[in-house]
Structures are given as structure tokens and as C-alpha cells.
């Protein structure tokens, strides 16, 4: 057993261009806190996977308000160390995740809000009992400087905290086969304490609390002989005399994994895959309980009242993640139809619909022509969420109420003069042009470049546009 200790030295903008904006402002003061998550081995697991070696949250740092115009300085930090106790041996190699969180203290609805500013991760080798190791990690434009160490809790000593030390019983020397405990020369290494009940003849241990079996013996306490009677199972090495060895109960028989862990056999023993919130050889240890306040953004911690039960966070609408740490971008799913504008109000989604559409998701196409009349013989045409009128000749406007001036748009080309006529308009073309809109030049030989003039009309005559 022992404690992993993390000391944050600074968190601020990293070197180089593109310094980040301060996470706090006069309008939105904030303070920082940190979370550390430890996992055994050099794993590259997802950030959401269990912190099997343990996790810890720091206290909140001092409230910080940005000075307008000033560059983002190193931000004020919480006091004290982050301490992650570990119950079993220190693994020597470990992976870490250190998260920097911002607690916004502005007067926003819902009180303080939490958001993840930066997350750094790494894999390291570290012997317990050694000096502080210094580290610098960058996350985007931010830089985190920190130190860490692992130390054993008495009576454990050694690089893995597996050797036990006891005060000397005799003043001069340690007992038979036991060495003095460096650096505590006045103490003696104690014999390893195997798991209670572990067979002294057929079992042994390399770490406190374990029980490993000598060949030919099995079971959690190495008290069950390996049967050689017949070959009923493929388990065990083959033998020339018996054909094979069939163990009695397998290491996973009776499921030694607590708290819903699943057991799988390994060449030498078994391995438990633990549910979230549990770790240890048999999933018997819980890293985080509801008392640690693992749920952010108003999440409610359910279960996890003690180290023997996993917690879950029930997240308020708009947040998700195992700790309610992720804001849900519900508008990214484009829930508003027919070009509606999506608004995420936190507690609910709203769609602001374009004209002519309605419904919670703008899914209803309104009957644009319902109750709308087009004047002067016009007919209503639906389309695109808005009604329009197709007006009778000589009328215009949204509802065909305006008498149209057919010449207002200057329809006659090449200097032709426009005359309003009861059935439309007439263009009087300039010399050299012809057509309903005076659009065709007349060739010098008198023939038109495009359609011939209708019978009875000479080039240059006024062209009535019907």
C-alpha cells in the first residue's frame, strides 16, 4: 500500500505564438481545479476507461479575474498535493491523465458551470520511494508543469511497496533470513503475509495478500490437488502416462471476481475485468465513491455510497459522459427541418421556423393559400413556405391589387418606345430593329436576322406584344 502524490507547479500559456485567451474574464470570473487518473501498466486506454489505480480531485483554486488587455498569465492554483492512495503493490509502470477543469462563477443560470480546459496524458516508469520526478506536458496552447512521486505507507517498503518492515525485536540483528530495511536500518524486513488460508505447503506469494500455487495444486488457497484420473477436459498439460491432466475446480470456478467483475483464466491464474468504479485483483476496491463528488454540471451521484458499490451520474438535460462532463451539442444532429434555425436552450431544443412552416421541428408545411385571396382574378400558388399570386394580365403586386404598368420594366430593347395597351404593351422599335421587344436587328438587305416579320407588318412597324 502507498500513495501517489502529484504537485501542480503551474498551468498557463505554453511558449511560442498563439497564446490562449485567459479562461476567465471580468464578466465571468473562474477558478481552476485538477483531476488525476492513474492506470497500471503502459496502457493507452480511452480517457473514459476506469482509473484502476485510483483517481483524485484537487481543491478549487483562488478565484481569478482576467485583467483586460493583459496576456493570460500562469493561473492561480489550488493549494496542496493531489493524493491517490493505492492498496495493492505499486506497479512500477503506470499511465496518467491530468485534467485541468474550469469552474465558472459568473451569474449564469444554474450556478457554477464546469468545463474541461485541458487534458494531458502520459506513460511513465516510476519506482516507489524514489525522489520527486518533474514533468512538463502541453495540451494545445496550454502548458502544465508538475512533479510526482509514489511513496509507500508503513509498514510497506521497496520499489513496489511489497516488502514489509517491522521494528526490530532484538537490538542487534534481524531474525533468521530477514534483512534490515534500508533506509530504515533500525527496522527489519518482515516475512510476506500471503492471503489468509493460503496453503503453507502448496502455495506461495510474491506480493502480500496473494496465493500462487505450486505445480499440481489449484484453487484460490492451493488446497485442491490437480486430478489425474481421466481426460475429460482439455485443461492442463498433457502427460505421457495419463494422457492429460484435468484440474479440479478451475481458477474462475465460483467466480472470484467481486462486484460484478468477469473472470478469465490466464496461464498462471485468473484475471478479473472490473466494472466501472472498481479495481484490484478481485474488483474488491472502489476508486471513487459519491462522497468524492464525481458528477459535474449538476449531475446527481447515484449508488457509490461506499467503496463496495459503483456510482453512476444521472446527468441533467444537455450533459452526458460518465461524469456529466460533456456538453451535448444537440443541434449538430440538425433536428430542425425545412431550413429551421436550431437553438439549444440547455433544458430544451427550440426550432425557429422559416415562414410557412411550423411545429416543434418545423415539420409542418402550412397551407400558404388558406384564407388568402388574390384580387382581380389572380390565382394563389403555394411554394417554399410562402404564398404568391399569379396575377391576371394588367395587374401585379403581392395580392394582384396593383394595376400593372407594363412599361415600368422598360421592356423594349434598342431604344424602342413602349406603349401601354389594354391587352398588354406595344413596342415601337427604333429604325433597324424589329420583334415584339425590338430585340432583332434588321439586315441591310431588308431581311431580318431572326424570324421573318409576320405578314402585314413591315420592319420598323410597331410590334404589339400579346
Amino acid at each position: 500500500a502507498g500513495v501517489f502524490e502529484l504537485q501542480i507547479h503551474s498551468f498557463g500559456p505554453g511558449p511560442g505564438p498563439g497564446a490562449p485567451r485567459s479562461p476567465c474574464s471580468a464578466r465571468l470570473p473562474c477558478r481552476l481545479f485538477f483531476r488525476v487518473c492513474l492506470k497500471p501498466g503502459l496502457s493507452e486506454e480511452a480517457a473514459e476507461s476506469p482509473c484502476a489505480l485510483g483517481a483524485a480531485l484537487s481543491a478549487r483554486g483562488p478565484v481569478y479575474t482576467e485583467q483586460p488587455g493583459a496576456p493570460a498569465p500562469d493561473l492561480p492554483l489550488p493549494d496542496g498535493l493531489l493524493q491517490v492512495p493505492f492498496r495493492d503493490a505499486w506497479p512500477g509502470t503506470f499511465s496518467f491523465i491530468i485534467e485541468t477543469w474550469r469552474e465558472e462563477l459568473g451569474d449564469q443560470i444554474g450556478g457554477p458551470a464546469w468545463s474541461l480546459l485541458a487534458r494531458v496524458a502520459g506513460r511513465r516508469r516510476l519506482a516507489a520511494g524514489g525522489p520527486w520526478a518533474r514533468d512538463i506536458q502541453r495540451a494545445g496552447a496550454w502548458e502544465l508543469r508538475f512533479s510526482y512521486r509514489a511513496r509507500c505507507e508503513p509498514p510497506a517498503v521497496g520499489t513496489a511497496c511489497t516488502r514489509l518492515c517491522r521494528p526490530r525485536s532484538a537490538p542487534s540483528r534481524c531474525g533468521p533470513g530477514l534483512r534490515p530495511c534500508a533506509p530504515l536500518e533500525d527496522e527489519c524486513e518482515a516475512p510476506l503475509v500471503c492471503r489468509a488460508g493460503c496453503s503453507p505447503e502448496h502455495g506461495f506469494c510474491e506480493q502480500p495478500g496473494e496465493c500462487r500455487c505450486l505445480e499440481g495444486w489449484t484453487g484460490p488457497l492451493c488446497t485442491v490437488p490437480v486430478s489425474t484420473s481421466s481426460c475429460l477436459s482439455p485443461r492442463g498439460p498433457s502427460s505421457a502416462t495419463t494422457g492429460c491432466l484435468v484440474p479440479g475446480p478451475g481458477p474462475c470456478d465460483g467466480n472470484p471476481c467481486a462486484n460484478g467483475g468477469s473472470c478469465s483464466e490466464t496461464p498462471r491464474s485468473f484475471e478479473c475485468t472490473c466494472p466501472r468504479g472498481f479495481y484490484g485483483l478481485r474488483c474488491e476496491v472502489s476508486g471513487v465513491t459519491c462522497a468524492d463528488g464525481p458528477c459535474f454540471n449538476g449531475g446527481l451521484c447515484v449508488g457509490g455510497a461506499d467503496p463496495d458499490s459503483a456510482y453512476i451520474c444521472h446527468c441533467p438535460p444537455g450533459f452526458q459522459g460518465s461524469n456529466c462532463e460533456k456538453r451535448v451539442d444537440r443541434c449538430s444532429l440538425q433536428p430542425c427541418r425545412n431550413g429551421g434555425l436550431c437553438l439549444d436552450l440547455g433544458h430544451a431544443l427550440r426550432c425557429r421556423c422559416r415562414a410557412g412552416f411550423a411545429g416543434p421541428r418545423c415539420e409542418h408545411d402550412l397551407d400558404d393559400c388558406a384564407g388568402r385571396a388574390c384580387a382581380n382574378g389572380g390565382t394563389c400558388v403555394e411554394g417554399g413556405g410562402a404564398h404568391r399570386c399569379s396575377c391576371a394580365l394588367g395587374f401585379g403586386g403581392r395580392d394582384c391589387r396593383e394595376r400593372a404598368d407594363p412599361c415600368a420594366a422598360r421592356p423594349c430593347a434598342h431604344g424602342g418606345r413602349c406603349y401601354a395597351h389594354f391587352s398588354g404593351l406595344v413596342c415601337a422599335c427604333a429604325p433597324g430593329y424589329m420583334g415584339a421587344r425590338c430585340e432583332f436587328p434588321v439586315h441591310p438587305d431588308g431581311a431580318s436576322a431572326l424570324p421573318a416579320a409576320p405578314p402585314g407588318l413591315r420592319p420598323g412597324d410597331p410590334q404589339r406584344y400579346l
Epitope: 444554474g110 457554477p112 459519491c290 468524492d292 449538476g298 446527481l300 444521472h314 438535460p317
Partner: antibody, heavy 118, light 108 residues
Amino acid sequence: QVQLQESGPGLVKPSETLSLTCTVSGASISSFYWSWIRQPPGKCLEWIGYIYYSGTTNYNPSLKSRVTISVDTSKNQFSLKLSSVTAADTAVYYCARIAVAGFFFDYWGQGTLVTVSS
Amino acid sequence: EIVLTQSPGTLSLSPGERATLSCRASQSVNKNYLAWYQQKPGQAPRLLIYGASSRATGIPDRFSGSGSGTDFTLTISRLEPEDFAVYYCQQYDRSPLTFGCGTKVEIK
């Protein structure tokens, strides 16, 4: 304006099941968690449980074996069933909306008194 | 579960006086997830404060909340006639959600 209205019988016989419905107006039932709370005459408030439209529920361990909360999004209603009632279940039963900022109660119904008596 | 103990049970004061109500938790309430409610006879409770110190919409500024960890306080700076009621605290840090048993503020 958000309004909640409890409805159901005011008198239930011992060992029977108490059934109440809360009708919500002014808010979509799909956007919030919804809860039941009770208060025996002259006594403290006791949280019974809550539900989210997705079906997520959470009940007070002291009542868990007897409580079922359900939701009907089409009617914008949620309901409470409490089985095997005794005189100790006599109380004013409130339905309430759980706030967005956390699991506290920002809107309450006016409450309905349920008496357990033969 | 977190047990909330409110004190005093009854507070006898006159209009215009300052009222200080206490709510003590059996375990630390993380992130100040604590709310205060006011209840008048025959009515449902009404939310006053959440997050230990944030006033709910429409609540007058004579009501203020403070505290953290296990000790929380509701203060009414100058009692108005309509403030005489029972006040409850509630934690929403972890399940089960729990209420205190109330402090009655009565006219002296």
C-alpha cells in the same frame, strides 16, 4: 407558465395500491426530469423518486420495493404507483419538475392529500 | 444517505428583524449542491436558493444563502410579513435526495 396538477383518489384502503397522475402544461415532459415528493401531515418532506422521458428512474431506497414511476409523453403526464400502502403512507403528495441546473425542484404541483384508511 | 439537520426548530422574530437559519449535513455536500425552499400553510414549497447561494428567479434580494461543505445558512435580512413560513433545505449532491425537517419562522 409551467403548471403541474396532481390527480387521483384521495382515499386508499390499506394493502391496496395508491395511484396518482401529474399533468404538465407549459413545459415539454421530454425536456426535464420529473419527481414525486410527499409530506405526511405536520412532518418532513420525503423524496419518492424521479423519471426522465427516456425511462431512467431513481427511487428512494426506503420506498424502492413498492414504487413505480412511469411517463406518458403523448399526454405530457407522469404517474406514481405505491403498492401495499399502510396508514404511514397518508400524506400530501406533490409532483415537481427537476431543474436544469441540478436535481432540485423549481416547479411544484399544489399537492393532493391521500389518506390510507379502511 | 446525507442527513440534513436544521436549527433552530422554531425562530420567533418581528417584522424588520434579521433571520438566520442553519442547515447542517452529516457528510460534506460536494460543489455546494444545496437548495432552500419556503412553504406556507396549505401551499407547495417554493424554491428560494440553489447552489447554496444562487437566488431563484423572482426571489427578492433580502434572501441570501451561504456556506459550503457541511454547514449552510439561509439569511433573511429584513423580515417582511409574507416571510413567516417554514423553510427547508435539500441536498442534491447524491442519491437519495434528502430534505431537512424545516425551521419555522413565526411572528414574535
